[in-house]
């Protein structure tokens, strides 16, 4: 069948069909209804909401829905143990302890099961000792403390501010610095934007609010037992000491009030800028130690959290494509939350739900996508990204051979300000025409394209007339498939305005505030930016699922290849003796990108010109587009981190958050002048220019005439 | 030597608003917090809330706003809906180390018809 | 909120008297307690900070000791300047909150 026999309903009114379909007033209905109680991974609130969504999908008309279960490793505190922090005097009495809850919001009182603030994986511990403060404990900041200052935080518990990089880096970072537990607090300069009111008044975070989340450094790897491999019922796990990721020294999260009791007696060093500076009224004394009359006072940490193996469940979606069901696009979010996910992951869920509604009434009327489309609700994202990695571990030789796209359906909103995309170049283009379609919400651009406002309010930093799409880091569900696997992905959602909000995130991110009501009265009260994104994330699934020739254009890939590489070559630049006594030469990596981009434009010209009517000729084409990205992974992976494989991009060493480019030629390069072996540093630098080469080299020819 | 220098008396009608001003020099206006307490007529001392951002007593919880001008040190004290008993000397401390070492010289607020 | 609980609420003594005045809270403050004398037309003025250490130019007649619930402040030998209302403030918990006052009166 072609694709146009597999429907009842004309192809160019199938996009309009499903659009038109989706409904503000049920992503608001779905998400009140998902965030009612708590549903934290691993608890039998989670499981329920996944039996019920599995029962809605299938009333929705999808060909099967499955739960697929993992018994993987995951964190609580003690019940009966709370996790605290103290201020103690000389003598060991507790003349301070931090909050052991958040107040909870108006009209969840009494709700049970709302998990105290922690962070997940943390060791159990109770060391004491004096403060250090670490800024926001990036890498630069322990540069700037060890190397500039001269302050030592071995022995020490440093107390950093969230915000700016993941806050398992601000562990990791930490426990190379020799601390020996760490707090992690929310600044307001960061978490409260001025002139907004704390919630319940407002979307700010109030001085009792905390931001709980996993301390991981996992690199990829899924369950911290079984790293490649499924968590199954036959899985052969690690001991506990030999897991993957796990913090190594205790750490635990606090609100701006409680900080303010440790901070304000600060001693020591005073801050080296205004750039260590928060909003709290207190010095920002880097320390170590309290001041003057404090100075026999230290702070002592109380952890008894404790790691385990839990059983976690994915709710898996099918809808059975007409023409090419071998061929997967898959749309998945997660459902697990810290608290009532009211943002973090409901606001995506909702949507999520409303795309199945959507897709679910076409096919009710006879409707078929081309291509078989898979719908996820992941487990334990929270957790390390466990329901989504594991699943993909346990179906990856399925995945890289029928993989065309993943589409992350997290939070759909973190602002109402403008659209916000991650994403392969391959899929600028569908995001530019798919944009350029949909109608935009914002104030001010009634009758006007959602691509005119985006590239308005968020305008490329290179292309004017463009939007700004930004490179997929990590830190969320996508990791997997992009970053191990090379499926082409994508993430879209509605974001603030990052020029007059300087904050991290949004102020209730992981807090118990994080409301159904947060949303409805304050973010989207009339749900036009959910609508807006679910049909950017729908449509984007649509097109991929639908459209004959796959809408990727390699083009993209060729113009970004040329500017990573030449960003990589000026860093290396810095450093002219070092390159020409080592004889660092870039001339193979642009060489491999001009032979690329001349490929990929020969290759854009046979895709005008090939016959669509021939059905063997198109399967080869998409596949050519389909494989691009797997073309990217290098088996062996990058040095240190196996799975992460992709060659052009890695999340940021630094920062999980972030997407790097060249990531191997870049960390080899990465304060390359402290290194006390620059003949071997060098070396290696060399070496990943190699790798970087031949990769882009070899994908370029996967695009070649393949005869 | 710090010192906190409050704007002048004040007579209110029942209903309106008075917004007290408190200058702060001598020390870094940004590392500490600024206070208001407030003592009526013969009374005990009754603190009106403070810290960073702001933290209201609950008793004056959405008719009190305190505000601060960092470029000019200067922090600010709005109380709303007045009534006869908010009749009081209204008094700037600064916060450090979670007390109030340094006040200003109070400012008496009379409310009458 | 925390109750501050001061006793006596007046007291009458002596030049040269030991005066001792009490402060209790009620749930734990740990050392977040604060004690100010007040004059009549005058502020305030701090006088013991975290329970017992004096702040700076205070005399040191004066000291401050307790943590958790109870807490006392002491005057070891009364001068003619100390005749005044003496206040404790709990600054623990994010709304502080004063003991309702001591008036030491000469006898």
């Known amino acids: 069948k072609s694709s146009n026999e597999a429907t009842n309903i004309t192809p160019k009114h199938n996009m309009k069909a499903f659009l038109d379909e989706l409904k503000a007033e049920n992503i608001k209905k779905f998400l009140y209804n998902f965030t009612q109680i708590p549903h934290l991974a691993g608890t039998e609130q989670n499981f329920q909401l996944a039996k019920q969504i599995q029962s809605q999908w299938k009333e929705f008309g999808l060909d099967s829905v499955e739960l697929a279960h993992y018994d993987v490793l995951l964190s609580y505190p003690n019940k009966t143990h709370p996790n605290y922090i103290s201020i103690i005097n000389e003598d060991g009495n507790e003349i301070f302890n931090t909050s052991l809850f958040e107040p909870p919001p108006p009209g969840y009182e009494n709700v049970s099961d709302i998990v105290p603030p922690f962070s997940a994986f943390s060791p159990q511990g109770m060391p004491e000792g004096d403060l250090v403060y670490v800024n926001y404990a990036r890498t630069e900041d322990f540069f700037k403390l060890e190397r500039d200052m001269k302050i030592n935080c071995s022995g020490k518990i440093v107390i950093a501010r969230y915000g700016k990089v993941f806050r398992g880096n601000k562990v990791k970072n930490a426990q190379l610095a020799g601390a020996k537990g760490v707090i992690l607090y929310s600044d307001p300069a960061d978490y409260f934007a001025p002139g907004v009111k704390s919630y319940p008044d407002g979307w700010n975070l109030p001085g009792g609010g905390v931001q709980r989340g996993n301390i991981l450094n996992l690199n990829g790897a899924g369950d911290p037992l079984t790293p490649g491999y499924p968590a199954n019922e036959y899985a052969y796990r690690r001991g506990i000491a030999e897991a993957v990721g796990l913090p190594s020294i205790p750490v635990h999260p606090i609100g701006y009030y409680d900080a303010q009791k440790l901070l304000e007696k600060m001693g020591g060093s005073a801050p080296p800028d205004s750039s260590w500076r928060g909003s709290l009224k207190v010095p920002y004394n880097v320390g170590p130690g309290f001041t003057g009359n404090f100075s026999t006072q230290k702070v002592k940490m109380h952890i008894h959290s404790t790691n385990e193996v839990t059983r976690i469940y994915n709710v898996i979606g099918t809808l059975r494509g007409a023409v090419e069901p071998d061929r997967y696009v898959i749309l998945g979010g997660h459902r697990d939350s810290w608290v009532f996910g009211g943002i973090d992951p409901q606001s995506g869920a909702a949507v999520v739900h409303e795309i199945v509604r959507s897709f679910g009434t076409l096919k009710k009327e006879g409707w078929r996508p081309r291509r078989t489309i898979l719908f996820a609700s992941w487990d334990a994202e929270e957790f390390g990204l466990l329901g989504s990695t594991e699943w993909a571990e346990e179906n990856s030789r399925l995945l890289q051979e029928r993989g065309v796209a993943y589409i992350n359906a997290d939070s759909s909103i973190e602002g109402n300000y403008t659209l916000r995309v991650d994403c392969t170049p391959l899929m600028y283009s569908l995001v530019h025409n798919l944009t350029k379609e949909l109608k935009s919400p914002d104030e001010g651009f009634e009758g006007k394209s959602l691509y005119e406002s985006w590239t308005k309010k968020s305008p490329s930093p290179e292309f004017s007339g463009m939007p700004r799409i930004s490179k997929l880091g990590s830190g969320n569900d996508f990791e997997v498939f992009f970053q191990r696997l090379g499926i082409a992905s994508g993430r879209a959602r509605y974001t603030k305005n990052w020029e007059t909000n300087k904050f991290s995130g949004y102020p209730l991110y992981h807090s118990v505030y994080e409301t159904y009501e947060l949303v409805e009265k304050f973010y989207d009260p009339m749900f036009k930016y959910h609508l807006t994104v679910a049909q950017v994330r729908g449509g984007m699934v649509f097109e991929l699922a639908n459209s004959i020739v796959l809408p990727f254009d390699c083009r993209d890939y060729a113009v970004v290849l040329r500017k990573y590489a030449d960003k990589i070559y000026s860093i290396s630049m810095k450093h002219p003796q070092e390159m020409k006594t080592y004889s660092v030469s870039f001339d193979s990596l642009f060489s491999a990108v001009k032979n690329f981009t001349e490929i990929a434009s020969k290759f854009s010209e046979r895709l005008q010109d090939f016959d669509k009517s021939n059905p063997i000729v198109l399967r080869m084409m998409n596949d050519q587009l389909m494989f691009l990205e797997r073309a990217f992974i290098d088996p062996l992976g990058l040095p240190d981190r196996p799975f992460y494989r992709h060659v052009i991009y890695a999340p940021s060493s630094h920062n999980k958050y972030a997407g790097e480019s060249f990531p191997g030629i870049y960390d080899a390069l990465f304060d390359i002048e402290s290194k006390v072996d620059p003949s071997k540093a060098w070396g290696e630098v060399k070496r990943q220019i190699y790798v970087a080469a031949f990769t882009v080299q070899a994908a370029a020819e996967t695009l070649s005439e393949v005869a | 030597q710090v010192q906190l220098v409050q704007s002048g008396a004040e007579v209110k009608k029942p209903g309106s608003s008075v917004k007290v001003s408190c200058k702060a020099s001598?020390?870094?206006?940004?590392?500490?917090?600024i206070s208001w307490v407030r003592q009526a007529p013969g009374q005990g001392l009754e603190w009106m809330g403070g810290?960073?951002?702001?933290n209201y007593a609950q008793k004056f919880q959405g008719r009190v706003t305190i505000t601060a001008d960092e470029s000019t040190s200067t922090a600010y004290m709005e109380l709303s809906s007045l009534r006869s008993e908010d009749t009081a000397v209204y008094y700037c401390a600064r916060d450090r180390w979670s007390s109030f070492d340094y006040w200003g010289q109070g400012t008496l607020v009379t409310v009458s018809s | 909120d925390i109750q501050m609980t001061q006793s006596p609420s007046s007291l009458s003594a002596s030049v040269g008297d030991r005066v001792t005045i009490t402060c209790r809270a009620s749930q734990n403050i740990g050392s977040y307690l604060n004690w100010y004398q007040q004059k009549p037309g005058k502020a305030p003025k701090l006088l013991i900070y975290a329970a017992s250490i004096l702040q700076s130019g205070v005399p040191s007649r004066f000291s401050g000791s307790g943590s958790g619930t109870d807490f006392t402040l002491t005057i070891s030998s009364l001068q003619p300047e100390d005749f005044a209302t003496y206040y404790c403030?709990?600054?623990?918990?994010?709304?502080?909150?004063f003991g309702q006052g001591t008036k030491v009166e000469i006898k």
């Open positions: 810290f960073t951002p702001v």
């Open positions: 403030l709990q600054s623990y918990s994010t709304l502080w909150t």
């Open positions: 001598g020390d870094s206006f940004s590392n500490y917090g």
